[in-house]
């Protein structure tokens, strides 16, 4: 392991579409991969009238945008589907939305998903 780098070996897994996709709904996903690739965790969710609906969580393939991020934070302004990624085991258990170039206080507090 490289000093100062948080290796990701497993992530929280969730799939809202688990019945159609015939996967588990929730669990822990081992992050396998080639030696030259870093692995991360991710979360995607929707904000429907203030209600948070998790879409997917799991391992995410080598992505410079996720390097050295210990927290899973979406910074895009009002996407249709929110996305964040991070490094470190199970770092996607909690995720949050803090849009960049936002003068006012963020409207969303950090989200801790409730178990289904």
């Amino acid at each position: 392991a490289i000093l100062g780098r948080s290796e990701t070996q497993e992530c929280l897994f969730f799939n809202a579409n688990w019945e159609k996709d015939r996967t588990n709904q929730t669990g822990v996903e081992p992050c396998y991969g080639d030696k030259d690739k870093r692995r991360h965790c991710f979360a995607t969710w929707k904000n429907i009238s203030g209600s948070i609906e998790i879409v997917k969580q799991g391992c995410w393939l080598d992505d410079i945008n996720c390097y050295d991020r210990t927290d899973c934070v979406e910074k895009k302004d009002s996407p249709e589907v929110y996305f964040c990624c991070c490094e470190g085991n199970m770092c996607n258990e909690k995720f949050s939305y803090f849009p960049e170039m936002e003068v006012t206080q963020p409207t969303s507090n950090p989200v801790t998903p409730k178990p289904p």
Epitope: D21, Y32, G58, W60
Partner: antibody, heavy 119, light 108 residues
Framework: EVQLLESGGGLVQPGGSLRLSCAAS????????MTWVRQAPGKGLEWVSA????????YYADSVKGRFTISRDNSKNTLYLQMNSLRAEDTAVYYC????????????WGQGTLVTVSS | DIQMTQSPSSLSASVGDRVTITCRAS??????LNWYQQKPGKAPKLLIY???ILQTGVPSRFSGSGSGTDFTLTISSLQPEDFATYYC??????????FGGGTKVEIK
């Protein structure tokens, strides 16, 4: 080096059967989901079937459901596609490909094997 | 099912040109969008995954952008080896992937 090598293609009559194989090397085969994608002559890419890393979950395009069966033997590092009740519209080059973790790209592909269904 | 629409279906360009290919999803696929290059008689090759992440070994003249429903593949300076067909693919509803119809890049 990751390598995928398909075999088993050929000429078959309508209603006939073929079994395609995909031999994998250069990676831990049992850790990855695998998929079959086909390409009819002069056409685009069409997803056909996929199988989870352990072989417990299988998925099919509507166009092949009930006729094709995907399977794998992790001890032999080999992926299979059993194709029954073949039709002329199944004529295509069939590729096996490795699926990586999300965003789940097909990051390595075999060279393809041609299946021709004709009388 | 999510439909993927690529445009244009073909284009003619010269070496050194900047080339842009677009891909639109019928509903949001977040960043679950991959791009492939295919040369005649060869297997597809992964270029970009996650909408913008360059696959190892792919030249930096290739770039991808977008999220949600609208995505772009850009070749900043077209090289002779780039004449090929390019496909987008959504992997949001895996394992039932859907591909775009392809864009053939031809020599002007």
């Amino acid at each position: 080096e990751v390598q995928l090598l398909e075999s088993g293609g050929g000429l078959v009559q309508p209603g006939g059967s073929l079994r395609l194989s995909c031999a994998a090397s250069g990676f831990r085969f049992g850790n990855y989901a695998m998929t079959w994608v086909r390409q009819a002559p002069g056409k685009g890419l069409e997803w056909v079937s996929a199988i989870g890393a352990s072989g417990g979950s299988t998925y099919y395009a509507d166009s092949v459901k009930g006729r094709f069966t995907i399977s794998r033997d992790n001890s032999k590092n080999t992926l299979y596609l059993q194709m029954n009740s073949l039709r002329a519209e199944d004529t295509a080059v069939y590729y096996c490909a490795r699926e990586n973790v999300a965003p789940r790209p097909l990051d390595y592909w075999g060279q393809g094997t041609l299946v021709t269904v004709s009388s | 099912d999510i439909q993927m629409t690529q445009s244009p279906s073909s284009l003619s360009a010269s070496v050194g040109d900047r080339v842009t290919i677009t891909c639109r999803a019928s509903q949001s696929v977040s960043r679950f969008l991959n791009w492939y290059q295919q040369k005649p008689g060869k297997a597809p090759k992964l270029l970009i995954y996650g909408a913008s992440i360059l696959q190892t070994g792919v030249p930096s003249r290739f770039s991808g952008s977008g999220s949600g429903t609208d995505f772009t593949l850009t070749i900043s300076s077209l090289q002779p080896e780039d004449f090929a067909t390019y496909y987008c693919q959504q992997s949001y509803t895996t394992p039932t992937w859907t591909f775009g119809g392809g864009t053939k890049v031809e020599i002007k």
